[in-house]
């Protein structure tokens, strides 16, 4: 059968379900893509006009193609091969009723089977499989895909190998200056300011233009590449870096002995399994965490979650998300929030934007 | 090179019989959707029917529901229009195209064959 | 039911000219609208897919534009070969046709 020829898919969602938030839908579809990028080299973004790769349609009855929906129950959704035009779009009855759980219909497990077909994959025979052709509700956050499943679409676009992973697939020095940049992670540590990416980090010292570029390992040997978010307590000179469920602390620039420790010691939920980006107020003495499109408070003092969390990252921080890859605070009144090669000064006195910057802009470039 | 080869048109009289055939090459003929579609004489294109690549779906316009079988066999790449019950109305010539590679039909007819003549008079 | 509009059924333009079809959905089709050029005698042939995309070794200056319920082809400057009727279609529908004429 057919396949896409390229690793980097677009995907549009043409019109949202009533059923469901705008938010919560955006999330259940990017949720549904990760799926399966997590297990092979392709890569999906969002895109909200023009042509995307694969469209995603709620719809009802007779809607544009040869197989009109039949009402509440039945056929739930559909989905095409990978081909141009209608090739790899997804189609969802409206007439279900769309959830984020186990009521109704829930969104997220059927977008993670149709988008299955969307990527070339056929029904399967094992009840345990995503791909297997009826629905059955199973705790999303726990959901695995089978090993049938993985097989399957790891026959048609191969593994997630370690280079196909990396932005920078020969792990060569990221060019400072590149107008794409982005950065994974970035926290101040004390007058400095530190920029990660892939196995590299930058050292801004503020207020002057030089900036220098190491390797983690040469200031931090114990500590992997790829550190995903990173905050700093200054009163307490204590820097905080994670990556995947774990996370090291440094104090005094040297890493305390017995990390890494999970994060879940934080309190998080078992379905996290990362965080993207983290920062700490010192003006409230709390560390907020941003995982995908939500956060969480953490009372730094009282070493517990803040209760009414998470929250919607668009929700509360207006114009930043719905995710975001990394975040510092400085000047005692910004959040520098960082959207792959885009960053925003945030005033979260006045909760708003005040500037929109290129990532790399600390860099005089 | 894609092509489709319809034959098996001729004069019939109404309510006869009449089987009509479409010999693909040139490319997997069991990996794609087919489908048929006609043109009365002097009139515009309309859509009969359609089959998936296993054969397993099968879909027809109203007007030929009930008198129509469409099938394939994918071991002679051939894809077939069992036609009964025919009527004066079904005079026209019969086109087989391919449509694309999957689990649903896209309705994107991009290769057609000739056409076949089907007349059905007394 | 989804019904297909086509205008006008007949037009007369000559060699050169900007000429527009247009094809109305009653009902929203995304972009999952077609156009097909067919010449007497012969078989249909695939000028546009999915509105816009224009099928390998159609001349450029064949383009469509259109998504929802509101769809156009337009060819930019008429050739003598561009005479022939025109279809829109989407799954099992099609328009009525548009016949080109030489004026």
């Known amino acids: 059968g057919p396949v896409w020829r390229k690793h980097y898919i677009t995907y549009r969602i043409n019109n949202y379900t009533p059923d469901m938030n705008r938010e919560d839908v955006d999330y259940a579809i990017r949720k549904a893509f990760q799926v399966w990028s997590n297990v092979t080299p392709l890569k999906f973004s969002k895109i909200n006009t023009g042509m995307a790769d694969i469209l995603v349609v709620f719809a009802r009855g007779a809607h544009g193609d040869f197989h009109a929906f039949d009402g509440k129950g039945g056929i739930l959704a559909h989905a095409f091969g990978p081909g141009s035009g209608i090739g790899g779009d997804a189609h969802f009855d409206e007439d279900e009723f769309w959830t984020t759980h186990s009521g109704g219909t829930n969104l997220f497990l059927t977008a993670v089977h149709e988008i299955g077909h969307s990527l070339g994959l056929g029904h399967s025979s094992d009840p345990k499989a995503v791909m297997f052709p009826t629905y059955k509700y199973v705790d999303i956050n726990t959901f695995r895909l089978s090993a049938d499943d993985i097989r399957g679409i790891q026959s048609l676009y191969g593994d997630p190998k370690e280079n196909q992973r990396l932005p920078n697939p020969d792990n060569s020095e990221p060019a400072l200056c590149d107008p794409n940049l982005s950065f994974d992670a970035v926290t101040t540590v004390g007058n400095k300011i530190f920029f990660f990416k892939d196995r590299f980090f930058w050292l801004k010292v503020s207020e002057r233009p030089k900036t220098s570029v190491n390797l983690i390992s040469s200031l931090w040997p114990t500590l992997p590449s790829g550190i995903e978010a990173a905050y700093e307590i200054e009163a307490r000179n204590q820097v905080f870096l994670f990556k995947d469920d774990k996370y090291w602390l440094i104090s005094n620039l040297r890493p305390e002995p017995n990390y890494p420790k999970s994060i879940h010691s934080f309190g998080f939920p078992n379905f996290v399994k990362k965080i993207d980006a983290a920062v700490f107020n010192p003006r409230f003495y709390r560390t907020y965490f941003f995982v995908d499109n939500q956060y969480w408070r953490y009372d730094e003092r009282r070493q517990m979650m803040d209760p009414g969390y998470p929250k919607l990252i668009t929700k509360n921080f207006q114009g930043i998300g719905p995710k975001i890859d990394a975040v510092f605070y400085s000047k005692n009144k910004y959040y520098y929030f960082f959207q792959g090669s885009n960053q925003f000064e945030y005033d979260f006195l006045l909760q708003r934007i005040t500037k929109t910057l290129k990532s790399n802009s600390w860099f005089g470039c | 090179e894609v092509q489709l080869l319809e034959s098996g048109g001729g004069l019939v009289q109404p309510g006869g019989s009449l089987r009509l055939s479409c010999a693909a090459s040139?490319?997997?003929?069991?990996?794609?959707?087919m489908h048929w579609v006609r043109q009365a004489p002097g009139k515009g294109l309309e859509w009969v029917s359609g089959?998936?690549?296993?054969?397993?779906?099968?879909m027809y316009a109203d007007s030929v529901k009930g008198r129509f079988t469409i099938s394939r066999d994918n071991s002679k790449n051939t894809l077939y229009l069992q036609m009964n019950s025919l009527r004066a109305e079904d005079t026209a010539v019969y086109y087989c195209?391919?449509?694309?590679?999957?689990?649903?039909?896209?309705?994107?007819?991009?290769?057609w064959g000739r056409g076949t003549l089907v007349t059905v008079s007394s | 039911d989804i019904q297909m509009t086509q205008s006008p059924s007949s037009l007369s333009a000559s060699v050169g000219d900007r000429v527009t079809i247009t094809c109305r959905a009653n009902q929203s089709i995304y972009t999952y609208l077609n156009w097909y050029q067919q010449k007497p005698g012969k078989a249909p042939k695939l000028l546009i897919y999915?509105?816009?995309s224009l099928q390998s070794g159609v001349p450029s200056r064949f383009s469509g534009s259109g998504s929802g319920t509101d769809f156009t082809l337009t060819i930019s400057s008429l050739q003598p070969e561009d005479f022939a009727t025109y279809y829109c279609q989407q799954a099992g529908i099609f328009g009525q046709g548009t016949k080109l004429e030489i004026k």
């Open positions: 089959i998936s690549p296993s054969g397993g779906m099968t």
């Open positions: 195209a391919r449509d694309i590679v999957g689990p649903y039909s896209a309705g994107l007819f991009d290769y």
């Open positions: 040139g490319f997997t003929f069991s990996d794609y959707w």
């Open positions: 999915a509105a816009s």
